[in-house]
Interface confidence: low
């Protein structure tokens, strides 16, 4: 049977009553159209919700939006387009809502034809109240925020400009023209680059990159012959034509560009890309794409400069450039990634890592399921996620992988149980320790949402039909209840809860549909009084993560260390809580093999910690470049994982010789970079 | 016990320099993101510099910047404040202090005295 | 840089009085405010964080509260060992900045 039928399943007391004082209805006074919703702040509770509806007219489109506001997580909304005196905004470029809790929202309205320029409304004050601002340009993006300082926003416009203002959007100024991409890094820098022959596209490949630390006051070039760049936990990324052909490398720098080094990492053609998969202090995941339409490409790991690389997992299927591939960060579990591959069969298969990518498996089969027709053997077969690339195909797919950082463990994803993906109908399938053990959770897709940072999840079930009812489930997926919040089922469009998972409030969004009319509606839903008192001390349990084999002295070491979580007992029906802080207790690992990655020439063969040299490049000599230099690299094949922690143990010991010798291939030298001031 | 001890303070002369350590003990050292901040003769504080748990990020008030540098150890559980270039205005008790993961400044060394005169 | 105002600069108080700090904001801060304790050759003390949250702890006599650019940090029934200094600081953006403190002395 599935899971919550099962008679053991304890039920939640007078739940029905509980939830019913708690659920609100809004009816928004709104023709169908489209919304879109946007929290503005942590554990503010404020809400902005933007409807906009197209009338083709015959000559041109009518548009009209209007914006409402809830300020106690959606139970109640306030109709406040007034506050931006009836103005249709643009919703292609959604509520640009400032970082942290700085409480600001930059919206963008539409303006007429003839116009010099476009128009935005700002708020600081968490949407209580709006200022117009005529723009001296026509944005062809959306305000950016610089991540240190919410004062600052930059903004490309419609002619290629890069402008810039200082205080929230109240004063623009253009600090560059010729501009195809602009980006914010650290300390209130901007990263662009520029063209000189005309256009952005015309000039793939021979742009500039540029850099002023100073918001427009002094520039530098950074780079020449750029196609494109990137920024990623504290790297920066540029993909650099080859001077004799139409090839290109990447190349890293850790100094805001003052800098640059080659990474270790195969070229691409023309028709290849390069993709940053994730990124963060330590370290880079990097996919370059294989030659040809394949459709997949491999991942690599990079040390902690970002320079040298080592082959982390083949045929990582991600399709062409900007398109779809399931790497999914498990935000749950430190060191965590999911992905598929796309085997020599054209099958696509799920595999995780544990290790910040040093070695991937197959995810166990669940113990509660059968393998389905794609298994050569009944009893031998795996669990395959669903993500990004089954809902770009259009599969019965309605939600990505979910994990929570504060509800440690938890991953809920739709999944099928073979050899690899079926586009049969999905099922819904939880890990409680992030991804080693699986179990069916719910029967067929659904939507779902973490809340109370694990404390409660809650799904509604996917389905053409409307619908009334809503699961919840306090012990992590085990056991499920029903709640009809509505007697009129409403046309589902989704879920919505605050970011964070730390909310017991979840909004139900739907229309309704009459002979005459649709309208927006959305159900709010107050989850507290079934969660009614706070928990304790008795209410945790102490949780070793990583852990595989519990006699094992070394048992949880994950890069170099361990950690013991507190977690909240299952059958504990309580609340962690707003304030709730995830408890843990690290402790350091002696290091081993796994606490080192294959270096640069070295690869591991399946089954085995061991490295080995690539047969090909046996017997010569590895040279990279290092900030410009040509560098000799001396190593018995190992280098420690970027964040690994371990100390004493297994120590391989790995030295790099400093040749002196000019890079001929780096086309970022120091030399050739300048300087101007405004 | 969670304890922070500050020490490296001194008499130094302007345009001099001087080398502020903080050892710490009693937390996981190496999970905390660490500040300095100092607090003038007239009791008025100034937050200084900021360095992450990893140590990748760092940032500083304007005050400070390109003269002082924030560093750690954690291996050694210690937290470094290099200050060249130092100016009478520098004179101050310069405290280490803990980020956790509610807020900036939930534990606090007992400061050390640095004084810049001729 | 936010600025921020801490009145007043002292109070008098006695044993079991209700006292109150403010501290104004020169921008909203939404709750990115804390409350610190210094006592003379004491280390600085969390009271306070987020506006409103007790650290572990702290007496419960403490309380904050306020959001946006105003808040507030009262001491419902002032005790013998509350004699202090006492400081809010902003961790909304950087630079992150202090109150110029308010000095809690006896009657």
């Known amino acids: 049977s599935a899971p919550g039928e099962d008679e053991e399943c304890g039920r939640v007391r007078d739940f029905v009553a509980k939830l019913a004082n708690n659920t609100h209805q809004h009816v928004f006074d709104d023709l169908r159209g489209s919304v879109s919703l946007s929290w503005v702040g942590d554990s503010t509770g404020v809400i902005l919700v933007l409807t906009t509806f197209h009338v083709p007219l015959v000559i041109m489109t009518f548009g009209q939006s209007k914006l409402y506001r809830s300020e106690d997580y959606g139970k109640n909304f306030k109709d406040i387009t007034d506050l931006i005196n009836n103005t249709f905004i643009r919703t292609e470029f959604g509520m640009a809502i400032g970082p942290e809790n700085s409480g600001k929202v930059v919206l963008t309205a539409e303006v007429s034809g003839g116009s010099r320029g476009g128009r935005i409304f700002r708020s600081s004050d968490f949407a209580k109240n709006f200022v117009q601002t005529d723009l001296p340009f026509h944005p062809l993006t959306q305000m950016m925020y610089s991540p240190q300082n919410s004062d600052y926003l930059l903004a490309l416009s419609t002619e290629n400009g890069l402008w810039v203002s200082k205080n929230f959007g109240g004063k623009w100024e253009e600090i560059h023209k010729a501009v195809c991409l602009a980006k914010w890094g650290s300390d209130n820098t901007i990263f662009f680059t520029t063209y000189a022959n005309g256009s952005c596209k015309a000039d793939l490949g021979a742009l500039e990159l540029w850099r002023t630390s100073d918001l427009g006051k002094s520039f530098k070039t950074i780079g020449v012959k750029i196609y494109s760049f990137g920024l990623g936990g504290r790297f920066l990324f540029a993909s650099v034509m080859a001077d004799k052909d139409t090839t290109r490398r990447i190349h890293v720098s850790t100094d805001q560009g003052d800098t640059w080094s080659m990474a270790q990492l195969p070229s691409v053609g023309q028709e290849q890309f390069y993709s940053i998969l994730a990124a963060n202090d330590d370290m880079v995941f990097m996919h370059v794409d294989e030659p040809g339409d394949t459709g997949f490409g491999t991942i690599f790991t990079s040390d902690d400069r970002g320079i040298v690389y080592s082959k982390s997992l083949d045929r990582h299927l991600y399709t062409t450039t900007g398109g779809e591939t399931d790497f999914t960060n498990v935000t749950s579990l430190r060191g965590v990634y999911i992905t598929s591959v796309l085997s020599e069969d054209n099958s696509i298969q799920t595999m995780i890592t544990f290790d910040q990518g040093g070695r991937w498996t197959h995810l166990r089969k669940p113990e509660n399921s059968e393998c389905d027709a794609t298994a050569k053997n009944k009893n031998e077969c795996s669990l395959h996620i669903h993500a990004s690339y089954s809902i770009s195909q259009k599969l019965n797919v309605p939600m990505a992988p979910l994990s929570e950082p504060n509800a440690v463990g938890i991953v809920i994803a739709h999944g099928s149980v073979g050899d690899a993906i079926s586009v049969m109908v999905p099922d819904v399938y939880i890990s409680d320790d992030g991804g080693y053990s699986w179990t069916k959770m719910l029967e067929g897709p659904h939507y779902y949402t973490i809340l109370d940072s694990g404390g409660i999840i809650v799904a509604i079930e996917h389905s053409s039909r409307p619908i009334n009812v809503i699961k919840f489930s306090t012990d992590e997926g085990q056991c499920w209840q029903t709640y009809t919040f509505t007697r009129d089922p409403i046309y589902f469009t989704g879920l919505a809860s605050e970011p964070g998972a730390r909310s017991m409030n979840i909004s139900i969004w739907g229309f309704t549909e009459s002979f005459l009319t649709s309208q927006w509606v959305s159900y709010t839903i107050d989850f507290k009084d079934i969660l009614e008192r706070n928990c304790e001390e008795k209410d945790y349990t102490i949780w070793l993560a990583h852990s595989t084999d519990p006699e094992d002295y070394e048992d949880g070491c994950i890069l170099g260390y361990k950690e013991q979580f507190l977690r909240l007992r299952k059958s504990s029906v309580c609340q962690n809580g707003r304030d709730y802080v995830v408890t843990k207790q690290p402790s350091i690992c002696l290091c081993s093999l796994e606490d080192f990655l294959c270096d640069f020439g070295y690869y591991r063969p399946e089954n085995d910690s061991k490295c080995v040299e690539q047969p090909e490049l046996k017997g010569h000599d590895l040279e990279f470049c290092l900030y410009g230099r040509e560098e000799h690299l001396t190593t018995n094949g190992y280098r420690k994982i970027p964040g690994d922690k371990c100390q004493g143990g297994v120590n391989p010991v790995r030295e790099v010789k400093d040749l002196k010798k000019k890079c001929t291939s780096n086309f970022l030298s120091p030399e050739k970079q300048n300087s101007k001031s405004n | 016990e969670v304890q922070l001890v500050e020490s490296g303070g001194g008499l130094v002369q302007p345009g001099g320099s001087l080398r502020l350590s903080c050892a710490a003990s009693g937390f996981t050292f190496s999970t905390y993101g660490m500040s300095w901040v100092r607090q003038a003769p007239d009791k008025r504080l100034e937050w200084v510099a900021i360095i992450s748990s990893g140590g990748s990020y760092t940032y500083y008030s304007d005050t400070v910047k390109g003269r002082f540098t924030i560093s750690r150890d954690n291996s050694k559980n210690s937290l470094y404040l290099q200050m060249n270039s130092l100016k009478a205005e520098d004179t101050a008790v310069y405290y280490c202090?803990?980020?956790?993961?509610?807020?900036?400044?939930?534990?606090w060394g007992q400061g050390t005295l640095v004084t810049v005169s001729s | 840089d936010i600025q921020m105002t801490q009145s007043p600069s002292s109070v008098s108080a006695s044993v079991g009085d209700r006292v109150t700090i403010t501290c104004h904001a020169s921008?909203?801060?939404?709750?990115?405010i804390g409350w610190l304790q210094q006592k003379p050759g004491k280390a600085f003390k969390g009271l306070i964080y987020?506006?409103?949250n007790l650290k572990d702890g702290v007496p419960s006599r403490f309380s904050g509260s306020g959001s946006g650019a105003d808040f507030t940090l009262t001491i419902s029934s002032l005790q013998p060992e509350d004699f202090a200094d006492y400081f809010c600081v902003q961790y909304a953006q950087f630079p992150y900045t202090f109150g110029q403190g308010t000095k809690v002395e006896k009657r």
């Open positions: 987020h506006g409103t």
């Open positions: 921008q909203g801060i939404s709750s990115n």
């Open positions: 202090s803990r980020s956790s993961s509610h807020w900036y400044f939930d534990v």
